[in-house]
């Protein structure tokens, strides 16, 4: 069936255009030659003016942005929600781990509290900060924990006769901690497990946050003028001929969209790789690569490390007695 | 003998956490996220098609608009942009992505590289030197509960289970913060903790 003849008065076009732009000044009363048009180039008289064309272009680009936003809405929500949930979950794990460790000290080594609570608190603060991307070195955190704990263990449990707050011997004890390997291989074990599990956790969160950034970027893309022209021709130029109910051809729409989105579609290759790499990472997040597993068991490893010190207590006290004799004499003087 | 935190531990020899059958864990939540993400793996390549299917396009009509005129839906002219002199579609593609898109591609390349570096090579997860350094006894098979760095007096087994969603809403705290009293119960070898809702500093 042939199309209806174009409206001789542009009346229909006016009522359509009024929805986009209240105020009718821009729509001609009757079809005009349209020699000033740049996008909707007419084959005959047209009901469009240059100003209308500009408005159509603006509307077309806005439509496109809205379509893009609705396309990504579900994906965006999925990643944003999960990033928040995992971040909070990791914080809860850290808090539990801290509580378990404090409880272990309180029940097994009450003489080491409250100093132990302070060191444990600081250690887990750094764990949290590290997960959130802070530039802290895991080995430094673990070393600091054992360096801080040993003087307290020595002065409170192994040699409780020493006067309190013996500063000079603390220097010596901190040094002895590493020189004599007083905790055996436990600090090294904790370093390995904590650094591996936290690295993976941190990159997992970083990846989710980057996912949000990728979607946000495409969500707020501003389309080029060329794209705006193509969209206008596809969606609105038919109006100029009074063809209000006609829809664009499917194949034509695909061609236009591919043109408009040529740049965006280039993300595809890297996006696929991103999801597959993230899957690979997640598949490997168990045992020492699972922070939940490692951190919630840390209290036990720390407990074992202190037991190790106690087991070797006699030997250690003698060695440290000699090594730090100078410091101890000064204190008793 | 040692006292252990919470109701997690019953006896140092077993130290098993009660396992709630379908309880949601962090690892199951992670796997679920990946499955959902994989359904969006073609998101970017499918965008042009998605937008066309969500904007007015002639589906059942015999005639459609090709940018210049009304044509039959299945004619050669339907897929082709009639206005050849206007500007070239090929040119538009040749311009390359916008700077903001190039930037995001660079960031994706970087994170992909990091993810690949961090991914645990299959079969290497149980690297003895790392996973069990300093451990003296007990065998932790793949199907068993996780083993955590432990001592000679029995493997410490902890089922890797955070009651994930419940924890988020109602979360156990033993912090030395006001209102959080911690009671050592010598008789039962456990600690009872008053719970507090929300995040304590």
């Amino acid at each position: 069936q042939p199309p209806p003849p174009p409206d001789a008065t542009c009346h229909q076009v006016r009522s359509f255009f009024q929805r986009l732009q209240p105020g009718l000044k821009w729509v001609p009363e009757t079809p005009v030659p349209g020699s000033d048009l740049q996008v909707c180039l007419p084959k005959g008289p047209t009901c469009c003016s240059r100003k209308m064309e500009e408005k159509y272009q603006l509307t077309a680009r806005l439509n496109m942005e809205q379509l893009l936003q609705s396309a990504s809405m579900e994906l965006k929500f999925l990643i944003i929600q999960n990033a928040a949930v995992f971040q909070e979950a990791f914080e809860i794990v850290v808090r539990h781990a801290k509580n378990y460790t404090n409880a272990m000290f309180k029940n097994n080594y009450p003489s080491l509290t409250p100093q132990a609570f302070e060191f444990v608190g600081e250690f887990f603060t750094d764990v949290s900060l590290y997960i959130l991307g802070s530039d802290i070195n895991v080995d430094d955190m673990v070393n600091e924990l054992f360096d801080s704990l040993f003087p307290v263990i020595y002065t409170q449990m192994m040699n409780p006769g020493l006067p309190e707050s013996v500063l000079d011997i603390n220097e010596c004890l901190r040094g002895a901690r590493r020189d004599l390997k007083v905790f055996g291989s436990f600090p090294k074990l904790i370093m390995t497990q904590v650094s591996k599990s936290l690295q993976v956790t941190r990159i997992f969160l970083q990846a989710l946050n980057l996912g949000i950034e990728v979607i946000n970027t495409t969500d707020h893309l501003k389309f080029s003028k060329d794209c705006g022209r193509m969209l206008t021709r596809m969606w609105y130029c038919s109006y100029c001929q009074g063809l209000m109910m006609v829809k664009p051809c499917g194949g034509y729409c695909n061609v236009v969209m591919q043109g408009c989105m040529a740049g965006v579609v280039e993300i595809d290759k890297y996006w696929r790789e991103y999801i597959l790499s993230l899957e690979e990472l997640v598949n490997g997040m168990y045992r020492i690569y699972d922070m939940e597993n490692v951190l919630l068991g840390l209290f036990s490893t720390i407990h074992d490390s202190i037991q190790y010190v106690q087991k070797n207590g006699g030997k250690l006290t003698t060695t440290i007695g000699k090594l730090c004799a100078h410091s101890q004499q000064r204190q008793y003087r | 003998s040692a006292y252990y935190p919470e109701d997690l531990f019953i006896d140092k020899k077993i130290l098993k956490v009660a396992h709630v059958e379908h309880e949601e864990t962090l690892s199951s939540r992670r796997r679920e996220l990946i499955q959902k993400l994989k359904s969006f793996i073609n998101f970017y390549s499918a965008l042009p098609g998605y937008i066309c299917s969500h904007s007015p396009v002639a589906e059942n009509d015999t005639l459609c608009w090709n940018g210049q005129e009304l044509v039959e839906r299945y004619s050669q002219k339907a897929a082709r942009n009639g206005m050849k002199n206007q500007f070239n579609l090929h040119e538009l593609k040749m311009k390359g992505p916008e700077p903001v898109v190039s930037q995001i591609i660079d960031k994706l390349k970087h994170i992909n590289q990091l993810l690949r570096t961090m991914s645990v090579p299959k079969g290497k997860v149980l690297d003895k030197s790392l996973d069990e350094e300093g451990l003296e006894s007990g065998d932790c098979g793949d199907d068993e509960d996780e083993c955590i760095g432990s001592s000679g007096d029995g493997m410490v087994k902890v089922k890797n289970q955070l009651r994930f969603l419940a924890e988020l809403a109602y979360d156990l705290d033993v912090d030395d913060a006001p209102g959080n009293k911690q009671h050592g119960n010598q008789k039962d070898n456990e600690i009872t903790t008053s719970h507090s809702v929300g995040n304590m500093p």
Partner: antibody, heavy 120, light 112 residues
Amino acid sequence: QVQLKQSGPGLVQPSQSLSITCTVSGFSLTSYGVHWVRQSPGKGLEWLGVIWSSGNTDYNAVLISRLSIKKDDSKSQVFFKMNSPQVDDSAIYYCGRNGGWLLRGFMDFWGQGTSVTVSS
Amino acid sequence: DVVMTQTPLSLPVSLGDQASISCRSSQSLLHSNGNTYLHWYLQRSGQSPNLLIYKVSNRFSGVPDRFSGGGSGTDFTLKISRVEAEDLGIYFCSQSTHVPWTFGGGTKLEIK
């Protein structure tokens, strides 16, 4: 007892680099971090950076491109170096031992200071 | 960076008097872990600074108990209950809650 002794030239030209050595005694560099701070009439006290017991470093972001802190544990020495010093880098430079917990710590013992004038 | 503002710039006192120095930070020094990393140093004339008080109110080893620190959030105070001659010099507050560490401009405690 704990001591930090500094040594370095008092006068530096902009074309040279500013180098100061901090030699410590009474404690081991394998168990304590050492910070660097400077004091000038115009800017007051300004934290420059730290080297931890592991050898890892943290720097003030404003100066990161010009600073380098290294150490030799066996000699108990920490080396501070600033490239392309300008006139407004003239100050008294101090090294100090880290007390407390890593970057949330404080300087519990200080060196005697090295007065540096940058002049062409 | 966190700006630390000390008042007064100069504090003339008589020996035996009480002295009070104020330090204000441009943002809260309360860390997410519940601790506040605000410290006080004293620099006597021609010498290096010495640590007096760490984490708001903890006296460093060997510091007399006439020195006390208090405050929270962004407002902190150092009090000297009875000023002695060896207390004269410039007092600095410093924070390590946020990186980089920053210092106050100093308060000079001098004899009236």
